[in-house]
C-alpha cells in the first residue's frame, strides 16, 4: 500500500482467483482514543471500532472511502484504490492501446519544435468517474523539471458502437536547450483513476523523436508562361524553431490527381519553392520534416491546381 | 579549416559532408524490428559517448561569439564515433556487408574530422570505452544503440555547419 495523495491510498493486488489479497491497517487521524467506529462509503454498517481498522483487501468491494466517526462526527477519511497485477503485469484497462508506433502504446506525444514544449494524448472509452494526473521530468535518476498542465478532454469520437474520448496535456521543460543533443529522455507519468481502480502509464522519449512540424504556410502557385508548369512556393510554419538557417526543414511536394489510384508525382527539396507540372483537377500538397533528423513529417498543406 | 588557433573552417564543405553523414546514419540504422533499445539498458553503453551539451557553444549565439568551442566538441565526437565504427563492435560478427552504409559512414566521419583538423594539429580526443561484447546479438544491439546516438549527434553537427555556412562564411 502506498499514498497517492493526502488520504488516498493505492493497494497493489495480485489478481487471480482465490488470491489472498493484502492486509491493510487503517489509522484514524485523530487524537481521540475511544468510541471510534468505522464505515465504508455510504453504508451505515459499522465495520469495526477502535483507532485502527484491519481489513483484508481482495476485490473492488473492499475498496472505497473508509471513514472513522465518533458520536456522529466524522474524524477522517481514507480512500482505498486498487491497482491490479495479473500474471505479473499491471492492468491497463482504463486507456486504449493506440498500437502506434508499436503495441502497448497508451500515451502518444508530439512536439512542434525544439523549445521543450510538447503535447501528450491518450484514448479511453470511459466517460465518467475518471481522473488523470500527469507528472514529467527529464531523466529519472537525477530528474530535471518539466511542468505539465491539467489533462483535459480534447476530443470525442464515435467508433462503431463505442464513443472514444481523447484527453491531452501540455508540458514544458523548465530550462530547455533547443540546440543541444539530448542525452537523457523525457519521462511522462500519467496516473489514471476510474472509480476505485488505479492505473499508471509511462512514456519515455527524446524531444527529437517526437518532433512533428506544423504544415508549411502560405502555399501559393504561380503559373509559368507558355507552360503547364507552375512554381509552388511556401514558408516555414510559424511554430517552427528559429533561426531557420540552424533549424532547417526539408520538404516533400506532391502532385495528386482526383483519383487516389492515379500515380503521385513527388519532389523532395530543401528550398521553399519547386517547379512542378499541374495536371487538370489535380492538387498540389507540401509537407515538412526536420532536415537532419528523420522524425515525423508534418501534415500536408494543399492547394488545387486550377 | 578549424584549427586550435581559431581560423575558420570550410563551412560549406563541412555542411555538405555533415548532411551526407545524416543521410548515411539513417540508412545505416533501420528501425529495429524486435529490439526495443530503451528497454535494453541504454545507460552503460551510451553514457560514455560525447554529447553536444548546452554549454558547448553550439547554439547560434555561441557560434557567433566563438565557434571554436563547438567545433572542438564536434571534432571530439567525430573521432570518437569513427573509432567506434572501426572497432570490433562493427568489424566483428555479424560481418558488415560489402556495401553497407556503415562502411561509408565510417569513411565520412573520418573525412569530416580531417576537414576540421588538418594534420599536425591536435585537439584532445576522448578515450573510447572498452566495449567488446562476445555474442553477435549483443554486438548487434550495441551497434543499434551507437548508430541511434550517432544520428542525434550528426543532426546537431549538421545544424551547426548549415548555420555557419549561411551566416559565418567569409
Amino acid at each position: 500500500i502506498w499514498e497517492l495523495k493526502k488520504d488516498v491510498y493505492v493497494v497493489e493486488l495480485d489478481w487471480y482467483p482465490d488470491a489472498p489479497g493484502e492486509m491493510v491497517v487503517l489509522t484514524c487521524d485523530t487524537p481521540e482514543e475511544d468510541g471510534i467506529t468505522w464505515t465504508l462509503d455510504q453504508s451505515s454498517e459499522v465495520l469495526g471500532s477502535g483507532k485502527t481498522l484491519t481489513i483484508q483487501v481482495k476485490e473492488f468491494g473492499d475498496a472505497g472511502q473508509y471513514t472513522c466517526h465518533k458520536g456522529g462526527e466524522v474524524l477522517s477519511h481514507s480512500l482505498l484504490l486498487l491497482h491490479k497485477k495479473e500474471d505479473g503485469i499491471w492492468s491497463t484497462d482504463i486507456l486504449k492501446d493506440q498500437k502506434e508506433p508499436k503495441n502497448k502504446t497508451f500515451l502518444r506525444c508530439e512536439a512542434k519544435n525544439y523549445s521543450g514544449r510538447f503535447t501528450c494524448w491518450w484514448l479511453t472509452t470511459i466517460s465518467t468517474d475518471l481522473t488523470f494526473s500527469v507528472k514529467s521530468s527529464r531523466g529519472s535518476s537525477d530528474p530535471q523539471g518539466v511542468t505539465c498542465g491539467a489533462a483535459t478532454l480534447s476530443a470525442e469520437r464515435v467508433r462503431g458502437d463505442n464513443k472514444e474520448y481523447e484527453y491531452s496535456v501540455e508540458c514544458q521543460e523548465d530550462s530547455a536547450c533547443p540546440a543541444a543533443e539530448e542525452s537523457l529522455p523525457i519521462e511522462v507519468m500519467v496516473d489514471a483513476v476510474h472509480k476505485l481502480k488505479y492505473e499508471n502509464y509511462t512514456s519515455s522519449f527524446f524531444i527529437r523523436d517526437i518532433i512533428k512540424p506544423d504544415p508549411p504556410k502560405n502555399l501559393q502557385l504561380k503559373p509559368l508562361k507558355n507552360s503547364r508548369q507552375v512554381e509552388v512556393s511556401w514558408e516555414y510554419p510559424d511554430t517552427w524553431s528559429t533561426p531557420h538557417s540552424y533549424f532547417s526543414l526539408t520538404f516533400c511536394v506532391q502532385v495528386q490527381g482526383k483519383s487516389k489510384r492515379e500515380k503521385k508525382d513527388r519532389v523532395f527539396t530543401d528550398k521553399t519553392s519547386a517547379t512542378v507540372i499541374c495536371r487538370k483537377n489535380a492538387s498540389i500538397s507540401v509537407r515538412a520534416q526536420d532536415r537532419y533528423y528523420s522524425s515525423s513529417w508534418s501534415e500536408w498543406a494543399s492547394v488545387p491546381c486550377s | 579549416r578549424a584549427v586550435p588557433g581559431g581560423s575558420s573552417p570550410a563551412w560549406t564543405q563541412c555542411q555538405q559532408l555533415s548532411q551526407k553523414l545524416c543521410t548515411l546514419a539513417w540508412s545505416a540504422h533501420p528501425l529495429v524490428g524486435h529490439m526495443d533499445l530503451r528497454e535494453e539498458g541504454d545507460e552503460e553503453t551510451t553514457n560514455d559517448v560525447p554529447h553536444i551539451q548546452c554549454g558547448d557553444g553550439c547554439d547560434p549565439q555561441g557560434l557567433r561569439d566563438n565557434s571554436q568551442f563547438c567545433l572542438q566538441r564536434i571534432h571530439q565526437g567525430l573521432i570518437f564515433y569513427e573509432k567506434l565504427l572501426g572497432s570490433d563492435i562493427f568489424t566483428g560478427e555479424p560481418s558488415l556487408l560489402p556495401d553497407s552504409p556503415v562502411g561509408q559512414l565510417h569513411a565520412s566521419l573520418l573525412g569530416l574530422s580531417q576537414l576540421l583538423q588538418p594534420e599536425g594539429h591536435h585537439w584532445e580526443t576522448q578515450q573510447i570505452p572498452s566495449l567488446s561484447p562476445s555474442q553477435p546479438w549483443q554486438r548487434l544491439l550495441l551497434r543499434f544503440k551507437i548508430l541511434r546516438s550517432l544520428q542525434a549527434f550528426v543532426a546537431v553537427a549538421a545544424r551547426v555547419f548549415a548555420h555557419g555556412a549561411a551566416t559565418l562564411s567569409p
Epitope: - | S27, P30, E93, P94, L97, Q135, P136, L140
Partner: antibody
C-alpha cells in the same frame, strides 16, 4: 506492422521467364535488404540471392548466376525477382524475406510465397 | 559454401516431451546461426536468432544454444501446435545456406 506481400501464382512453359514481385510496408524499405528463397515441392529451403534496397547491390547463388535478376523500386517499396530460361525443376514456392542492408543477418518477416509451376 | 547438416531428419514425439534438434556446420560460423519453424502451407517463421536469442513473440519453451560448428534447438515441453519442419540457417558467409530440415510429427 512489417509486411511483405507477394504477387500471385504463375504457370510457365519451359524456356519462359517469370517475374515475382514483393511489396513491402511498415518499415523504411531502403534500410534493409531483400532475400529470395525457394522451396521445391516437399523439399527444403534454398537461398537464391539478396539485393540491398539501399544500394541496389546484389549477390546471387552460384548455380542461378546468369538466369536470375533481382531489382528494387524504392518509389513503390517493391522488390522483384526475375528467373529466365525456366526448367521443370524450377517449379517451387518462391519467398521474399527481409534482412539487414548492413550486415549478414537473419530473415524476418517472410512473404506469403508465390507458387511458380513450370510445365509444358 | 557452408553445409549445414541437421539431425534427425524426422522425429515422432508425444506432447510434453523434450525435443532436441542439432545442426552441424561444415566450418566455423561463430554465433551466426538462426532457427525457423515452417508449418505445412505456411511461410517459415523466425524462432531463434544468433544461436540463442528468442525472437519476439516466440513461446519460452523454444531455446537455442551452441557456437562454432555445433548448435542445438530445444523444445522443452512439446505442444501439439509445434508439429512442423524446423530449419537452421547460417548468415556467417555468403552464400547463405539452410539445413535440410527436421520434420516433427506429434504422436
Amino acid at each position: 506492422q512489417v509486411h511483405l506481400v507477394q504477387s500471385g501464382a504463375e504457370v510457365k512453359k519451359p524456356g519462359a521467364s517469370v517475374k515475382v514481385s514483393c511489396k513491402a510496408s511498415g518499415y523504411t524499405f531502403s534500410s534493409y535488404g531483400i532475400n529470395w528463397v525457394r522451396q521445391a515441392p516437399g523439399q527444403g529451403l534454398e537461398w537464391m540471392g539478396w539485393i540491398s534496397a539501399y544500394s541496389g547491390n546484389t549477390d546471387y547463388s552460384q548455380h542461378l548466376q546468369g538466369r536470375v535478376t533481382m531489382t528494387t523500386d524504392t518509389s513503390t517499396n517493391t522488390a522483384y525477382m526475375e528467373l529466365r530460361s525456366l526448367r521443370s525443376d524450377d517449379t517451387a514456392v518462391y519467398y521474399c524475406a527481409r534482412a539487414s542492408a548492413n550486415w549478414y543477418d537473419y530473415f524476418d518477416p517472410w512473404g506469403q510465397g508465390t507458387l511458380v509451376t513450370v510445365s509444358s | 559454401e557452408i553445409v549445414l547438416t541437421q539431425s534427425p531428419d524426422f522425429q515422432s514425439v508425444t506432447p510434453k516431451e523434450k525435443v532436441t534438434i542439432t545442426c552441424r556446420a561444415s566450418q566455423t560460423i561463430g554465433g551466426s546461426l538462426h532457427w525457423y519453424q515452417q508449418k505445412p502451407d505456411q511461410s517459415p517463421k523466425l524462432l531463434i536468432t544468433y544461436a540463442s536469442q528468442s525472437f519476439s513473440g516466440v513461446p519460452s519453451r523454444f531455446s537455442g544454444s551452441g557456437s562454432g560448428t555445433d548448435f542445438t534447438l530445444t523444445i522443452h515441453s512439446l505442444e501439439a501446435e509445434d508439429a512442423a519442419t524446423y530449419y537452421c540457417h547460417q548468415s556467417s558467409i555468403l552464400p547463405y545456406t539452410f539445413g535440410q530440415g527436421t520434420k516433427l510429427e506429434i504422436k
